[in-house]
């Protein structure tokens, strides 16, 4: 009876369990009743990082110097190239596909620490009583306006992104 499932590092094809290709190799031809799976090593700038049945290897990532990228770790037949940014620049994501001088803190967040050559901007959420309505790499959260000190009253409550709105007190006649 033909198998319906195969062992680890095997795959089912034509009612038969074939060995997967090891990392660093691609599939040339499936196994048959009489032959083993045929695999070939990936080329110079290619890789496959899992046991696989891929017919094409993946291209190594290109660390584009025009985007401020450089090679942190050269790729092998089993691993992709790892890019990083030039000194003083910071990756925009874990995958490090582009570089920024520093990131900005979004509205509702203030700058806790300005970026340096080694660390990116550190943002913190604006606590109650403070707000930030801008995207900035240097501005802290600002305190809400104190309406009382201006002899006014709060007409609209503040949020982490907006200041309070002050207005005149209702005068009793």
């Amino acid at each position: 009876e033909p198998p319906t499932a195969c062992r680890e590092k095997q795959y089912l094809i034509n009612s038969q369990c074939c060995s997967l290709c090891q990392p660093g190799q691609k599939l040339v031809s499936d196994c048959t009743e009489f032959t083993e799976t045929e695999c070939l090593p990936c080329g110079e700038s290619e890789f496959l990082d899992t046991w696989n049945r891929e017919t094409h290897c993946h291209q190594h990532k290109y660390c584009d110097p025009n985007l401020g990228l450089r090679v942190q770790q050269k790729g092998t037949s089993e691993t992709d190239t790892i890019c990083t940014c030039e000194e003083g620049w910071h990756c925009t994501s874990e995958a490090c596909e582009s570089c920024v001088l520093h990131r900005s803190c979004s509205p509702g967040f203030g700058v806790k620490q300005i970026a340096t050559g080694v660390s990116d901007t550190i943002c913190e959420p604006c606590p109650v009583g403070f707000f930030s309505n801008v995207s900035s790499a240097f501005e802290k959260c600002h305190p809400w306006t104190s309406c009382e000190t201006k002899d006014l009253v709060v007409q609209q409550a503040g949020t982490n992104k907006t200041d309070v709105v002050c207005g005149p007190q209702d005068r009793l006649r």
């Epitope: 025009n66 985007l67 925009t92 920024v100 001088l101 900005s104 900035s136």
Partner: nanobody, 116 residues
Framework: EVQLLESGGGLVQPGGSLRLSCAAS???????EMWWVRQAPGKGLERVS?????????YYADSVMGRFTISRDNSKNTLYLQMNSLRAEDTAVYHC?????????WGQGTLVTVSS
Amino acid sequence: EVQLLESGGGLVQPGGSLRLSCAASGFTFRDYEMWWVRQAPGKGLERVSAINPQGTRTYYADSVMGRFTISRDNSKNTLYLQMNSLRAEDTAVYHCAKEPYSYDYWGQGTLVTVSS
């Protein structure tokens, strides 16, 4: 296409002054926070000064506080850095930068050399 063109650098004696300019094009200048960043020979990047879009709030690194003044003219799409009481350690290539501060917006910069 975003372009930032720095100018105004040169050779100046210690204690002297220079005014750097950054002419911006390809984006709505008045909407963006702007920075001056410098790189001394063989050293890393140092964030010198920043200014908010309206020009009402500024930031200065401790190393330039009280000597440098950042400003902007939104009608001329230009950022400025007035540098007074210059020191040898201010020698660097000065760059302006805009949000989102990506590498492909990075200009050539303008070289400031402070030497007697």
